[in-house]
């Protein structure tokens, strides 16, 4: 059989994104997300 | 365009108190989410803590919750940081930023404008 393996030599960065709730409607607070590899996941 | 003037900055001890000052120009202050960051020699520099526009939401960093309290007075153009509980490993350079609204406030580089810091230094 066959073994597959990833291995691109890329590291995927991760970022860790907050935004303030009020900037983009009326409610209080922060919003948390995650960014890996440029793309918004959460 | 808003020019950052931080104050405030000393030696205290460690369980001490600071209260940090950054004064703003420019009338579009409150258009702006403020933050407080700092730069501890060999260290990256860190978000420490931000407010909205408004001064409704605040967010900080895990390991200044409890100790740190951030504020703003739209009517003075001045963002504030009180700092107590104070530990030498909150020795840095603290410095005030602004950014523009719809920015994740945690990001260093979305930042447009900044001051030229205060030191402040917790000795033990």
């Known amino acids: 059989d066959a073994e597959f393996r990833h291995d691109s030599g890329y590291e995927v960065h991760h970022q860790k994104l907050v935004f303030f709730a009020e900037d983009v409607g009326s409610n209080k607070g922060a919003i948390i997300g995650l960014m890996v590899g440029g793309v918004v996941i959460a | 365009e808003v020019q950052l003037v931080e104050s405030g900055g000393g030696l205290v001890q460690a369980g001490g108190s600071l209260r940090l000052s950054c004064a703003a120009s420019?009338?579009?202050?409150?258009?702006?989410?403020m933050a407080w960051f700092r730069h501890a020699p060999g260290k990256e520099r860190e978000f420490v803590a931000a407010?909205?526009?408004?001064?409704?939401?605040?967010y900080y960093v895990d390991s200044v919750k409890g100790r740190f309290t951030i504020s703003r007075d739209n009517a003075k153009n001045t963002v504030y940081l009180q700092m107590n509980s104070l530990k030498p490993e909150d020795t840095a350079i603290y410095y005030c930023a602004a950014a523009p609204r719809g920015r994740s406030i945690v990001t260093t580089a979305t930042y447009d404008y900044w001051g030229q810091g205060t030191q402040v230094t917790v000795s033990s």
């Open positions: 407010i909205s526009r408004s001064g409704g939401s605040t």
């Open positions: 420019g009338r579009t202050f409150s258009t702006y989410n």
